[in-house]
Amino acid sequence: KFSKQSWGLENEALIVRCPRQGKPSYTVDWYYSQTNKSIPTQERNRVFASGQLLKFLPAAVADSGIYTCIVRSPTFNRTGYANVTIYKKPPSCNVPDYLMYSTVSGSEKNSKIYCPTIDLYNWTAPLEWFKNCQALQGSRYRAHKSFLVIDNVMTEDAGDYTCKFIHNENGANYSVTATRSFTVKDE
């Protein structure tokens, strides 16, 4: 079925988009599949639906489960499924595989690392970037919009990169982190 995996960390913001896209004018209803209970749209709730988006502000481990979105046009109803898993923060610095987004490759000429899922959030620059839990410092690293650009890429630049940013919702701030591996390939 039309399903998408999403994951996040407890006490962080998580925003999930309905995998079944529709035109902006279409209405979207969200349900928690296990109970068939409707997700509220009122923003005072910790978990609420906002059109195509389902927002966990912040997320809790108990939020894990399958969420159903039904996109309604005047004549068609189409269903999507968001499989959401919320994890406890890992105690050590190493990010487990299940929290990793897709690996990206870079070379000397092209070394952009995109911060995963950031387009779903209301954030303002600059992004914070970490490699293997260490904050990136030095002129070789440039945070540009939703990307990290590394100048003069070397083999040693390979590793796990984490972006951290703040999502703002009605004046309240929530932290979001996302990690992906970066590999260096020869030209």
Epitope: K1, G22, F76
Partner: antibody, heavy 123, light 107 residues
């Protein structure tokens, strides 16, 4: 009421050209993707070409790529199919149809169809 | 391109009988599959979308099922007006493709 009305079909010699039109009414034409589908006599349905709504991106079947051009005039609520270098195998009833849903990068079903216009390519 | 194979090519049944039509995709189309009905001299009419949802105005005797590569259109009790050709169509990716059709004829 949604209506699609094709015109422009007829008899044409191999190598010739023809321009089909599809006049749409009863809906906001500009926001919908539109499609041409054809059906050779006694045969099944074959997708020919699609055009996005306001964005205007186009897609073609391999069998017509480079010979046919789909276009639209949203101010006139009209869809077109310019057919050049016609071959005998292009002989078919040509239907225009509406995709009521699709978003950029996706497609959906065809919920309204015209009555079709017959194109015959023969010498 | 994704090839859709319909079976049988022809189904000979009497009014009131149950019709079961099959559509098999050469690769997974998730549930992005539709069924159409076409009568002689007419344009196709949408019956089912997203594998199992009836389009507006389609009688409840028409139902669709399946996901991935194997799909079924069932007409629970054939009415005289149901004798026609039925096509499946996938829309998960371009080029959009149709099956070759199943003709449901009066026995």
């Amino acid at each position: 009421e949604v209506q699609l009305l094709e015109s422009g079909g007829g008899l044409v010699q191999p190598g010739g050209s023809l321009r089909l039109s599809c006049a749409a009414s009863g809906f906001t034409f500009s926001i919908y993707d539109m499609i041409w589908v054809r059906q050779a006599p006694g045969k099944g349905l074959e997708w020919v070409s699609s055009i996005r709504g306001e964005g205007g991106g186009t897609y073609y079947a391999d069998s017509v790529k480079g010979r046919f051009t789909i276009s639209r005039d949203n101010s006139k609520n009209t869809l077109y199919l310019q057919m050049n270098s016609l071959r005998a195998e292009d002989t078919a009833v040509y239907y225009c149809a509406r995709d009521p849903w699709s978003t950029e990068g996706s497609f959906f079903v065809l919920d309204y169809w015209g009555q079709g216009t017959l194109v015959t390519v023969s010498s | 391109e994704i090839v859709l194979t319909q079976s049988p090519a022809t189904l000979s049944l009497s009014p009131g009988e149950r019709a079961t039509l099959s559509c098999r995709a050469s690769q997974s189309v998730d549930d992005d599959l539709a069924w159409y009905q076409q009568k002689p001299g007419q344009a196709p009419r949408l019956l089912i979308y997203d594998a199992s949802n009836r389009a507006t105005g389609i009688p409840a005797r028409f139902s669709g099922s399946g996901s991935g590569t194997d799909f079924t259109l069932t007409i629970s009790s054939l009415e005289p007006e149901d004798f026609a050709v039925y096509y499946c169509q996938q829309y998960i990716t371009a080029p959009l493709t149709f099956g070759q059709g199943t003709k449901v004829e009066i026995k």
